[in-house]
């Protein structure tokens, strides 16, 4: 029951956090946490990389033409997020929710 509740909250909150708070002034801790999550779990977006299309930051000029954050890249270099290609984006690897679910299941046993 606890796992199910945690799982539901993760699903509801992660995409909301990514779309509304990522790279917004005053939310540097959130940005850093999302970057770390994507890099360490080899994932991109909440469900998949296309989730980033809804991000206020990605949609603005501040993103500099990126379609995903640079932290979605397998090899991170500045502006690597401009090309949403599976060769350097955690695209086929799935979203971060799936990766987090697996991690939580393994550590709650």
């Amino acid at each position: 029951a606890y796992y199910q509740q945690l799982n539901t909250e993760l699903k509801e909150n992660l995409k909301d956090t990514m779309t509304k708070r990522y790279h917004q002034p005053g939310h540097e801790a959130v940005t850093s946490a999302v970057d770390q999550l994507q890099q360490e779990f080899h994932c991109c977006g909440s469900n998949n990389s296309q989730d980033w299309r809804d991000s206020e930051w990605i949609r603005s000029q501040e993103a500099g033409g990126r379609v995903v954050p640079d932290s979605c890249c397998k090899t991170v270099v500045a502006l690597c997020g401009q090309r949403d290609h599976a060769s350097n984006i955690y695209k086929v690897e799935g979203g971060c929710i799936t990766k987090l679910e697996t991690f939580i299941q393994e550590h709650l046993r």
Epitope: P25, E56, W57, S60, Q61, S71, A78
Partner: antibody, heavy 118, light 111 residues
Framework: EVKLVESGGGLVQPGGSLKLSCAAS????????MSWVRQTPEKRLEWVAY????????YYPDTVKGRFTISRDNARNTLYLQMNSLKSEDTAMYYC???????????WGQGTLVTVSA | DIVLSQSPASLALSLGQRATISCRAS??????????MHWYQQKPGQPPKLLIY???NVESGVPARFSGSGSGTDFSLNIHPVEEDDLAIYFC?????????FGGGTKLEIK
């Protein structure tokens, strides 16, 4: 050509209110983050308000938090700054500004002067 | 808040000389390989003008005489050769962490 035109400045007494406007043209306003930056008579620059492209996120430094409110009307291509409980230290030239890409402010208006004095 | 310390506060140079303005941040302004430090020029009666963004990228329309360098906490703006038109105040600004802050400015005068 990108154009930002501020208006609404003037002389106001301490404790008073003022609403600044910034009319934008020459770019897709609704996809641009916007900021207000002020410059004191001593030429010091201070970033005083930020609003995300869709208006969902705002940010204020502690010096103005609770007194200033930034808003935008994407249909009218206009940015606003509502300033309440004004203090003498709020006396400055107020500029609206936005980055071209990234976070360096490439586009600035000519500014509107706000003087808070009894 | 990240404090930006600019030096010198003022600089008087002859035409053709090199101007070097320094900006030191109280914390790193690096983000995923990008230095979120920018440089502006402000002439009397005008708003600031972006010269350099992200430490070393020259903004469109800015003469090649202007260059920026640095990373982490230490940055510099170079102008070479200095021309009459460069008489202005120069500011650095960081956008790594809110509130975004500006340096105190460096006034460049021509001898």
């Amino acid at each position: 050509e990108v154009k930002l035109v501020e208006s609404g400045g003037g002389l106001v007494q301490p404790g008073g209110s003022l609403k600044l406007s910034c009319a934008a043209s020459g770019f897709t306003f609704s996809t641009y983050t916007m900021s207000w930056v002020r410059q004191t008579p001593e030429k010091r620059l201070e970033w005083v308000a930020y609003i995300s492209s869709g208006g969902g996120t705002t940010y204020y430094p502690d010096t103005v938090k609770g007194r200033f409110t930034i808003s935008r009307d994407n249909a009218r291509n206009t940015l606003y700054l509502q300033m309440n409980s004004l203090k003498s230290e709020d006396t400055a030239m107020y500029y609206c500004a936005t980055p071209r890409i990234g976070t360096g402010f490439a586009y600035w208006g000519q500014g509107t002067l706000v003087t808070v004095s009894a | 808040d990240i404090v930006l310390s600019q030096s010198p506060a003022s600089l008087a140079l002859s035409l053709g000389q090199r101007a070097t303005i320094s900006c030191r941040a109280s914390a790193s302004v690096e983000y995923y390989g990008t230095s979120l430090m920018h440089w502006y020029q402000q002439k009397p009666g005008q708003p600031p003008k972006l010269l350099i963004y992200e430490a070393s990228n020259v903004e469109s329309g800015v003469p090649a005489r202007f260059s920026g360098s640095g990373s982490g906490t230490d940055f510099s703006l170079n102008i070479h050769p200095v021309e009459e038109d460069d008489l202005a105040i120069y500011f650095c600004q960081q956008s790594r962490k809110a509130p975004y802050t500006f340096g105190g400015g460096t006034k460049l005068e021509i001898k």
